[in-house]
């Protein structure tokens, strides 16, 4: 029977800069029941605080609700593991909420084949930002990435959409059923999970041009940019 091994705080994430959760990995338990507690203080402060909520984030977690989350402070935290034989402490982790944001996936993904009479057909993809994110405050800039592939293909084709919430793709294989997904990330932070896949059947008469893809950028006032396959790959493939 031994004191517990050193725990490790391995991840902290916030969905929207308003709340956040940190998770730790226990060390060895020393063969005894072990209690874990997370304590923290904020930069410039010596008042030590205890984790306000060990439940919401699941096992080995600490959740900081809205009233405990301050965007303008660095949190300095550590986990204490204690059993009958003694204690051990994790290394201190410095957490700035601004840099740990991982949003929920974008919502309301809609995909449509557009076949205007006067120009080439295209795939139109549209989505909404995740509900927890308030873009109006200006605290957030969300960037989006789209991936799509024929249903039976192994490789995804990835497009970076910038801040726009709609996107047009010209080059597709006629007669194929495509899967389309979108994800987002804040300017500082982590990519969300991919949204649930939306399926779209591309008509057999969908004409395509292997050389070019057509991308419409809302923030260019609806102007359309022709981007060569090479440029697209170079600038937008991740």
């Amino acid at each position: 029977q031994l004191p517990p091994g050193k725990p490790e705080i391995f991840k902290c994430r916030s969905p929207n800069k308003e709340t956040f959760t940190c998770w730790w990995r226990p060390g060895t338990d020393g063969g005894l029941p072990t209690n874990y507690s997370l304590t923290y203080h904020r930069e410039g402060e010596t008042l030590m605080h205890e984790c306000p909520d060990y439940i919401t984030g699941g096992p080995n977690s600490c959740h900081f609700g809205k009233q405990y989350t301050s965007m303008w402070r660095t949190y300095i935290m550590m986990v204490n593991a204690t059993n009958q034989m003694g204690s051990s402490f994790s290394d201190e982790l410095y957490v700035d909420v601004t840099y740990i944001v991982q949003p929920d996936p974008p919502l309301e993904l809609a995909v449509e084949v557009k076949q205007p009479e006067d120009r080439k057909p295209y795939l139109w993809i549209k989505w909404s930002p995740p509900t927890l994110i308030d873009l109006k405050t200006g605290w957030f800039t969300l960037l989006y990435e789209i991936r799509l592939k024929p249903e039976k293909a192994a490789e995804w084709e990835i497009h970076f959409a910038g801040q726009q919430t709609e996107f047009k793709i010209l080059s597709l294989h006629p007669g194929q059923k495509y899967l389309v997904q979108v994800r987002c990330k804040p300017d500082h932070g982590y990519w969300s999970a991919w949204s649930p896949a939306t399926f779209i059947q591309i008509p057999s008469d969908f004409t395509m041009n292997d050389e070019q893809k057509l991308i419409s950028e809302e923030d260019l006032g609806g102007e359309q940019k022709l981007i060569s396959e090479e440029d697209l790959h170079h600038h937008h493939h991740h």
Epitope: R42, M48, H49, E50, P52, Y68, S70
Partner: antibody, heavy 118, light 107 residues
Amino acid sequence: EVQLVESGGDLVQPGESLRLSCTASGFTFNSYEMNWVRQAPGKGLEWVSYISSSGGTKYYVDSVKGRFTISRDNAKKSLYLQMNSLRADDTALYYCARLNGVDVFDIWGQGTMVTVSS
Amino acid sequence: DIQMTQSPSSLSASVGDRVTITCRASQDIFNYLAWFQQKPGKVPELLISAASTLQSGVPSRFSGSGSGTYFTLTISSLQPEDIATYYCQRYNSAPLTFGGGTKVEIK
């Protein structure tokens, strides 16, 4: 409604003891750090003591260290201040105050009066 | 311990006047500073936290500024209901010290 109600104030003689209580309602008491703050008649506010949400961490102002003990019973949603060896300069209105998540006193009780006099 | 010095200790001003109260910390406290208002016979109420964040429900004529060791509370246009004693308080470490208070009266 979020509320803190203090009780236990009394007139006592120097050297005697007194126990103050504060009962919370309308919020999840065991998630909040709590404090006692006092105000002598006609004087300013003086922070007395702090206790963390589980009771594991406690702080005191120097003038009461060794004489006062803060404690809490989360099951009863109650905060306590055990005051021993009371002195005349402990005479004050004692407030119980909640510390919000970013360390500010956001909710105060109405106070309970402690008078130490011979 | 860090001392909090408030000035003036009292002031008298006319309705509509701009009133400024200052609070100095004996050491750097970043912006871990709160302002409270205590009306006669009443419980203190939180006006401002983090030196400049106005609490919800507090009139916009109140504002706070400062960082480090020097802080101010400003009432842009004094109203009769603002008669009270105002306290600054630091909250970055124990003891959670209050300033001595500033009593505001109407001329």
